[in-house]
Interface confidence: low
């Protein structure tokens, strides 16, 4: 299964698969999990080794028992790939870090008054993988303002060097947030020209377009049908670049489809997973099991759950069945993809689901990164659990914040249904940045029961937390997808990079917003929230945010909205707004709904017909 | 029967140039990537250039990039390998080779020699 | 650039002998790996493509195998035309790279 937790001052002995550099543990996690061998890795902080070469190391690890032998290494961080880990799966990275400069080949140097404009040129650039910016401190003057875009052969850094006043990141691409747009088409019996990048085998142009997607440097392909005229060329997926970006020249070529990465595209990539099935095709590949199964899908569930299997063939052959299973056979290769394919067979192959982000369990996401007062604008995915719970009685208005916990499941505040239990006047909206892109053509979601705390009284602080099924599951993406649960009654974790989001009020008699807000605000312990509030009880059951100074806060309209920390690269639920005196007032802090101490309520509301939970709290 | 003829070498001094030619027959050039490796006297092989099969796109090793250029002519069935600047450590047999679609070369010329000498 | 490395650098058998030949890519590379016979004087001859695969009109004592970093030539049977020197390629990415070659001698 998902495996989230990281080993601080751990560092996995043997299994090498391959190493890079890169700026800190979750983009090495990020990169295991995407790499086909990939099951464990262990980063080298800058400080954890005075071995500049190792700076930075971060070393991509397999092994058949999925685990090895764990040596103390003072700062490493150790974890595993999140294949398997459904939603969590994105290799999307919006992290900007400081002080660092990560090397590669500089193709192209502009001047810009930010580092986040320098990033918005890294991802508006089809080439550029990831970026550095001089800031107005630099030591050089005439570097300041630089921002430099790059990449390199394998889409990392190829070293990364502590720098004063230089910030680094990479291209949003990933995010799905290129302004390039992208080409859809799929050009049939036309052959693209330019520089290989890879080959690989694959059944179908749509997968080899994928693989395309995902790998670094690969911005086009051609691919050789099984009919393709040269036996040794069938199905071979040529991933291709060119200096230009796009193709140079094509050649029209009887049985070759090309086309392009969309990884340039805008508000949607594909998943980073095949879950077509070949009727009558073999894959060839290093063994890695035979199971006698019934049914080819049942071969994919098994492979799917088996970690280390990439791909399966079904065979239907008579000596290869008994009563009604039959042999699946489990492989893998190097490069995640067959070394064979066979066609005119009595099997059924198909691809491993483990880096699909649709899948039914909805463990915590680590990926990504409130009108609050006192906050500034979101931008697009960076809080991608937020929904706007709005009704329409005669004009619809946004009334409540909720998050995301699962494909059919919103958390949200139980206030916010005082007056208006009927679950018909609710449309949910999930996926967006500004009220104002909402049109009649928008798509919503309708709301199949709601679920208020038993404990819950009107005009009472305590129990403010509602459960809401939604008539149908909503499909993960970069925009929206879950927020990871606490552990239950999670007393332990000290959370210092708390964020409040919303479209509230800025001010406390004020309007709601049209961009999504957020605000960063700390944890005030339950004792000096209580000082604040002596004429309410401030329970365990709470938890309480905000400025003694006040001037950043939730208010009027972010209600159930979520109260999110950062904790060891992974993004929490800890509160659910609820309540507080007035708007960001000078020692008056938000008072919030404490999710970890209902945990056990939600896991019971949350089981599905069948007995399985539909939320999955962190390993 | 497919086939690859160099030619083309000879001596010349440094800072000269020389251009080599490779004719092909028996087989469709227009479709197949193109390649030239050398071999040095004593030592092994050395990929030099490649160019796509419509000559769109090319290629170069970066011991030669800026001094040397490929080029190809398909209705001439006729490979190019233009080079300048030439120094004693470009002194080699060059071959031309064909490129089958896994990058290996499955057919070879029998090679031009290329000295460079004062 | 992928740095292949092959081994030994020369080595010398009998006719009929069962010779390998490895190579190590600095890099993982699939299947991308090579295998050419030249002679002095002579154009380079392809024998395996994409580690394993035989070109026509090779003799089947000629075999290939591997993945990922290390691959090996196997002459199952050596015979007296087969005295030459032997190179590893990868054509994994650009730019192509050679191993520094293979001697085999009569003993």
């Known amino acids: 299964g998902c495996l989230t937790q990281l080993y601080e001052n751990a560092f996995f002995r043997g299994g090498d698969v391959a190493s890079m550099y890169t700026p800190n543990a979750q983009y090495c996690q990020m990169r295991c999990t995407f790499h086909p061998r990939c099951l464990l890795f262990s980063f080298l902080p800058a400080s954890s080794i005075n071995d500049m070469e190792k700076r930075f190391g971060c070393f991509l690890k397999d092994s058949v028992t999925g685990t090895l032998p764990k040596v103390h290494r003072t700062g490493a961080v150790s974890g595993h790939s999140l294949k398997q880990c459904g939603h969590q799966i994105s290799a999307c990275h919006r992290d900007i870090y400081k002080g660092v400069d990560m090397r590669g080949v500089n193709f192209n140097v502009s001047k810009v008054s930010s580092v986040e404009e320098c990033q918005k040129r890294c991802t508006s650039n089809i080439r550029c993988q990831f970026f550095s910016y001089a800031t107005q401190t630099f030591h050089k003057a005439e570097y300041r303002n630089n921002c430099l875009l790059k990449y390199s052969p394998g889409g990392t850094p190829t070293a990364i060097k502590v720098l004063s006043n230089v910030e680094s990141g990479f291209s949003l691409k990933p995010c799905a947030l290129s302004e390039i747009g992208c080409h859809m088409n799929i050009f049939q019996h036309l052959a693209f020209s330019d520089v290989d990048v890879a080959r690989v085998l694959t059944p179908d142009a749509f997968v080899c377009r994928t693989i395309c997607t995902y790998h670094p440097n690969c911005l086009f392909f051609t691919f050789y049908t099984n009919v393709w005229k040269i036996e040794s060329q069938r199905n071979v997926c040529l991933l291709k670049t060119s200096e230009s970006g796009t193709p140079s020249s094509s050649t029209p070529q009887e049985n070759t489809i090309s086309g392009y990465s969309l990884l340039t595209c805008k508000r949607t990539l594909p998943e980073p997973c095949h879950s077509k099935i070949y009727p009558g095709v073999d894959f060839g590949g290093e063994e890695l099991n035979v199971t006698f199964v019934k049914g080819v899908n049942v071969c994919q569930e098994t492979c799917t759950k088996m970690i280390r299997c990439q791909f399966f063939t079904y065979s239907l052959l008579p000596e290869d069945c008994k009563e009604e299973k039959c042999k699946c056979f489990l492989r893998l290769s190097m490069d995640g993809s067959p070394t064979r394919i066979a066609y005119g067979t009595q099997g059924s192959s198909g691809y491993s689901l483990r880096l699909c982000n649709t899948g039914d369990n909805s463990v915590c996401t680590t990926k990504t990164s409130t009108r609050i007062v006192g906050g500034t604008n979101s931008s697009w995915g960076e809080w991608p659990w937020q929904v706007s719970l709005q009704v329409k009685l005669t004009a619809q208005r946004h009334l409540c914040g909720g998050s995301l916990i699962g494909h059919q499941w919103v958390l949200t505040a139980a206030h916010c249904f005082d007056g208006l239990p009927l679950q018909d006047v609710w449309r949910i909206y999930s996926g967006i940045l500004n009220l104002s892109d909402i049109t009649k053509d928008t798509p919503f979601s309708q709301i199949k029961e709601i679920i208020i705390h038993q404990n819950y009284k009107v005009s009472e602080g305590n129990h403010d937390i509602a459960l809401i099924k939604l008539q149908a599951p909503l499909n993960y993406t970069e925009f929206q997808k879950p927020i990871c649960l606490p552990s239950k009654g999670d007393t332990s974790t000290i959370y210092t990079n708390c964020w409040v989001t919303g479209w509230g009020f800025s001010k406390e008699k004020g309007e709601i917003q049209n961009i999504l807000q957020k605000v960063n605000i700390p944890l005030v312990t339950n004792e000096e929230c209580q000082k604040r509030y002596q004429d309410y009880k401030i329970t365990q059951r709470m938890v309480c945010a905000g400025y003694k100074e006040g001037g950043k806060d939730a208010c009027k309209g972010d209600s159930g909205g979520p109260l999110v920390c950062k904790h060891n690269g992974m993004w929490r639920l800890v509160g659910i707004t609820s309540w507080g005196e007035g708007c960001a007032r000078r020692e008056q802090p938000g008072v919030y709904t404490k999710v970890a101490e209902y945990m056990d309520w939600i896991l019971e509301k949350t089981q599905s017909s069948d007995g399985k939970a539909q939320m999955q709290s962190p390993a | 029967e497919v086939q690859l003829l160099e030619s083309g070498g000879g001596l010349v001094q440094p800072g000269g140039s020389l251009r080599l030619s490779c004719a092909a027959s028996?087989?469709?050039?227009?479709?197949?990537?193109m390649n030239w490796v050398r071999q040095a006297p004593g030592k092994g092989l050395e990929w030099v250039s490649s160019?796509?099969?419509?000559?769109?796109?090319?290629t170069y090793a970066d011991s030669v990039k800026g001094r040397f250029t490929i080029s190809r002519d398909n209705s001439k069935n006729t490979l190019y390998l233009q080079m300048n600047s030439l120094r004693a450590e470009d002194t080699a047999v060059y071959y031309c080779?064909?490129?089958?679609?896994?990058?290996?070369?499955?057919?070879w010329g029998q090679g031009t020699l290329v000295t460079v000498s004062s | 650039d992928i740095q292949m490395t092959q081994s030994p650098s020369s080595l010398s058998a009998f006719v009929g002998d069962r010779v390998s030949i490895t190579c190590r890519a600095s890099?993982?590379?699939?299947?991308?790996v090579n295998w050419y016979q030249h002679k002095s004087g002579q154009a380079p001859k392809l024998l395996i493509y994409?580690?394993?695969s035989l070109q026509s009109g090779v003799p089947s004592r000629f075999s290939g195998s591997g993945s990922g970093t290390d691959f090996t030539l196997t002459i199952s049977s050596l015979q007296p035309e087969d005295f030459a020197t032997y190179f590893c390629?990868?054509?994994?990415?650009?730019?192509?790279?050679f191993g520094g070659g293979t001697d085999v001698q009569i003993r």
């Open positions: 080779a064909r490129e089958e679609q896994q990058g290996g070369f499955d057919y």
């Open positions: 028996g087989f469709t050039f227009s479709q197949y990537p």
């Open positions: 160019i796509s099969s419509s000559g769109g796109f090319t």
């Open positions: 890099q993982t590379i699939s299947v991308y």
């Open positions: 994409g580690a394993s």
């Open positions: 390629q990868q054509s994994y990415s650009i730019p192509f790279t």
